[in-house]
């Protein structure tokens, strides 16, 4: 697990609520699921569903789970160790240059052109020319132009917070 | 407290280097500790963190699986090996100790620069 | 990750001034943030932590206040060795910077 990890937040300040575990640190670190008090002696427990730490650690607070957008399905939930998995839903994509939000893939190829791989969580579809091989610059087509397609089963998780 | 960097140097983008910290003056294998760094005329950049014995370490996205943290408590020092070394990674590289009951750094080495260029 | 954001970059101030130097943290960090002063060539040196506690042998003149997002580092009466770059670090999530203010001789 990276460190600095992306969609981050702090949970919001709290103090040890009687609910939350503590034990002492480890060569002065805490093991993932927790983090450290302020003094430094005692390593306390994430709160379920609500934040994380996912490595060994001086945090003074867990991280704050990331909550899903509209338009996104959870693929599995926020844990005290992992961050929730979000994914775009099916029919949409995220690219790496525009990670805030999924988009809607296109439904078929510009006339001349054969689809050469499917929609996914993570990409649109893909064409190619017929003659030449090479990829299409991703313009939508006209709807009579197009050769149709369905989109692609979801495969894996396109956006990994965490 | 001491802490005195060595290991820098110019190094081709791509290759490796090792810095260590020679640490006195304290109970060093009672400390974590941690490696931060500063570009020419930047910030301040952490960069490593080790604990006391050695067991558990962790790094930001911009250096982990290509930088390691280790330790010898036998003799006092600290290293950062540093593979597939980029330009973005020329700066000045300090050793700093992690003060008690602060959870922040309280101590640093006057630092080695590590030139990556071809 | 969090932001640090430090203002001014560079000020020109006379011995026996007071300096203010601000920091705003892009989310709460509670009151986990440092203080350190650099002169060039020399590694930086811890002034404050926990936003406004006095490190050992820190002169009085140095004062650090606030919580949450926003930080002060306060310089009572300037004084000869005193102009540097100072720095503030937040330590609630990993370890982040702000981008120094260098405090010059007016």
């Known amino acids: 697990e990276s460190a600095l990890i992306t969609q981050q937040d702090l949970a919001p300040q709290q103090r040890a609520a009687p609910q939350q575990k503590r034990s002492s640190p480890s060569e002065g670190l805490c093991p993932p699921g927790h983090h450290i008090s302020e003094d430094g002696r005692d390593c306390i427990s994430c709160k379920y569903g609500q934040d994380y730490s996912t490595h060994w650690n001086d945090l003074l607070f867990c991280l704050r789970c990331t909550r899903c957008d509209s338009g996104e399905v959870e693929l599995s939930p926020c844990t005290t160790t992992r961050n929730t998995v979000c994914q775009c839903e099916e029919g949409t994509f995220r690219e790496e240059d525009s990670p805030e939000m999924c988009r809607k893939c296109r439904t078929g190829c510009p006339r001349g052109m054969v689809k050469v791989g499917d929609c996914t969580p993570w990409s649109d579809i893909e064409c190619v020319h017929k003659e030449s091989g090479t990829k299409h610059s991703g313009e939508v087509p006209a709807v009579e132009e197009t050769v149709t397609s369905s989109p692609g089963t979801p495969a894996s998780p396109c956006s990994l917070s965490g | 407290v001491q802490l005195v960097e060595s290991g820098g140097g110019l190094v081709q983008p791509g290759g490796s280097l090792r810095l260590s910290c020679a640490a006195s003056?304290?109970?060093?294998?009672?400390?974590?500790m941690s490696w931060v760094r500063q570009a020419p005329g930047k910030g301040l950049e952490w960069v490593a963190t080790i604990s006391s014995g050695g067991s558990y370490t962790y790094y930001p996205d911009s250096v982990k699986g290509r930088f390691t943290i280790s330790r010898d408590n036998a003799k006092n020092t600290l290293y950062l090996q540093m593979n597939s070394l980029r330009a973005e990674d020329t700066a000045v590289y300090y050793c700093?100790?992690?003060?008690?009951?602060?959870?922040?750094?309280?101590?640093w080495g006057q630092g080695t620069l590590v030139t990556v260029s071809s | 990750d969090i932001q640090m954001t430090q203002s001014p970059s560079s000020l020109s101030a006379s011995v026996g001034d007071r300096v203010t130097i601000t920091c705003k943290a892009s989310q709460d960090v509670g009151t986990a943030v440092a203080w350190y002063q650099q002169k060039p060539g020399k590694a930086p040196k811890l002034l404050i932590y926990w936003a406004s506690t006095r490190h050992t042998g820190v002169p009085s003149r140095f004062s650090g206040s606030g919580s949450g997002t926003d930080f002060t580092l306060t310089i009572s009466s300037l004084q000869p060795e005193d102009f540097a770059t100072y720095y503030c670090q937040q330590y609630s999530s990993y370890r982040t910077f702000g981008q120094g203010t260098k405090v010059e001789i007016k």
């Open positions: 700093a100790r992690r003060g008690d009951s602060m959870i922040t750094t309280d101590y």
């Open positions: 003056g304290f109970t060093f294998s009672s400390y974590v």
